[in-house]
Interface confidence: low
């Protein structure tokens, strides 16, 4: 099933319009904003989700603004151009013809330029470091239990193959989840680590993208894990190209 047949909805993406107009009257869902057909048996690409989000006027939030020592999403929301497969186009431009190159998770990886800016290829983000700080608890979580719960979450909720969760580190109150997925490792049908990280980020913020599901209720041995801040660092297979002025 690409979508739930009984009431024709998309379990993995609430930002869709679904109707029984697919082959043989099957339920087919299209992403808001782009109108592209999506596979509701897996996660929708981040590019299509951002495009859908921009089409909904009520969503005007900015993303976290961590330090600039790493490649982080400092630019907030934008209306991206997606390719026919739903991936980010390597070059993104705004309404005023300011352009920049992005990586596979849509984060800017060059200085901004004009329409003459070239972005030769979409550079893959192969390592994502999710840095979480949890709210105070009676004591530290047991690391093995925390590790198991987060791996279970990524496997079951986001359908990410366990081999792509490289490590879960914990030093109270900081949790670091490392997702790693090289181009050569990602097989057809594998969820992209960028998409899994984006769904997780939205879940943590209480903005679940799943249809009809309750929000994320993360518990470690029954103890609620409440996140008070999230930083996500993106590491690309090819280093980003910023001029020195951005690094000062």
């Amino acid at each position: 099933h690409t979508a739930a047949q009984d009431n024709c909805t998309c379990p993995t993406n609430k930002m869709t319009v679904c109707s029984p107009d697919g082959p043989g009257g099957r339920c087919q869902c299209r992403a808001l904003g782009s109108g592209m057909a999506v596979d509701c048996s897996t996660l929708t690409s981040k590019c299509l989700l951002l495009k859908a989000r921009m089409s909904a006027p009520k969503n005007a939030r900015t993303l976290v603004r961590p330090s600039e020592h790493a490649l982080v999403d400092n630019d907030g929301l934008y209306d991206p151009d997606c390719d026919p497969e739903g991936r980010f186009k390597a070059r993104q431009c705004n309404q005023t013809s300011v352009c920049w190159c992005v990586n596979s998770v849509g984060v800017r990886r060059t200085d901004k330029g004009d329409l003459s800016l070239r972005c030769d290829e979409l550079v893959r983000t192969h390592h994502i470091l999710i840095d979480l700080r949890h709210r105070p608890t009676a004591g530290a979580f047991n690391h093995s239990d925390l590790d198991a719960e987060l791996r279970r979450l990524f496997r079951e909720r986001y359908r990410l193959h366990p081999k792509f969760v490289a490590a879960v580190h914990y030093e109270q109150p900081t949790i670091q989840i490392e997702l790693r997925q090289n181009t050569s490792q990602k097989a057809a049908g594998d969820v992209d680590i960028g998409d899994a990280a984006y769904y997780f980020e939205r879940d943590i913020k209480g903005e679940s993208l799943f249809q009809g599901r309750g929000g994320l209720d993360l518990r470690v041995r029954g103890e609620p894990l409440q996140v008070e801040r999230t930083l996500i660092y993106y590491l690309d297979e090819i280093p980003p190209k910023f001029s020195m002025k951005r690094l000062t």
Partner: antibody, heavy 117, light 107 residues
């Protein structure tokens, strides 16, 4: 080819500090942790801590927390490990090693630090 | 911190024999264990990562198994160059820790 090249041997007096460097090449420097591991003569391996060059995030072994500082210089792809208040039991070979979330795949050649009065 | 206990401390075997090295963790660490070989005067060399994953360039006679708390490194048939010290290391939580090592010596 991935390479980690460390600075040369050092002889220090008790109470002094030593700063060992580790220059990386052949891979994206900011993408992988650099760990520091030491080995006293005839002893096993002991993890001292690590640094994530992308954002200078560090983790130190509690045993060394008050004495060790790890820094990085992205312009030269070099990581530094400074150990202060040296004592005789700090005499060891100090190794840097890159960590790609899948074991310490690459190692420096080691730097012998001798602490003697 | 997680304590890794390796046994035996010394293993005396002849070339061609099978070597079985054990590493026990003080708590469940899933498969976050890595194995290294070290020869005198050299830096350690990664042999196996995540308990059983093989490394490019490492001979197939080296294999790893186990999960949770008990792990094994097996050398199916010892070659003369395999006589060395072997260490396990965990990356399940900081601080990372190493086992005390197992010396494989010629009988």
């Amino acid at each position: 080819e991935v390479q980690l090249v460390q600075s040369g041997a050092e002889v220090k007096k008790p109470g002094a500090s030593v700063k060992v460097s580790c220059k990386a090449s052949g891979y994206t420097f900011t993408s992988y942790w650099i760990n520091w591991v030491r080995q006293a003569p005839g002893q096993g391996l002991e993890w001292m801590g690590n640094i994530y060059p992308s954002n200078s995030y560090t983790n130190y072994n509690q045993k060394f927390k008050d004495r060790v500082t790890m820094t990085r210089d992205t312009s030269t792809s070099t990581v530094y490990m400074e150990l202060s208040s040296l004592r005789s039991e700090d005499t060891a070979v100090y190794y840097c090693s890159s960590y790609r979330s899948d074991g310490f795949a690459y190692w420096g050649q080691g730097t012998l630090v001798t602490v003697s009065s | 911190e997680i304590v890794l206990t390796q046994s035996p401390a010394t293993l005396s075997l002849s070339p061609g024999e099978r070597a079985t090295l054990s590493c026990r963790a003080s708590q469940n660490i899933g498969t976050s264990i890595h194995w290294y070989q070290q020869k005198p005067g050299q830096a350690p060399r990664l042999l196996i990562y995540f308990a059983s994953e093989s490394i490019s360039g490492i001979p197939a006679r080296f294999s790893g198994s186990g999960s949770g708390t008990d792990f094994t490194l097996t050398i199916s048939s010892l070659e003369p160059e395999d006589f060395a010290v072997y260490y396990c290391q965990q990356s399940n939580s900081w601080p990372f820790t190493f086992g005390g090592g197992t010396k494989v010596e010629i009988k």
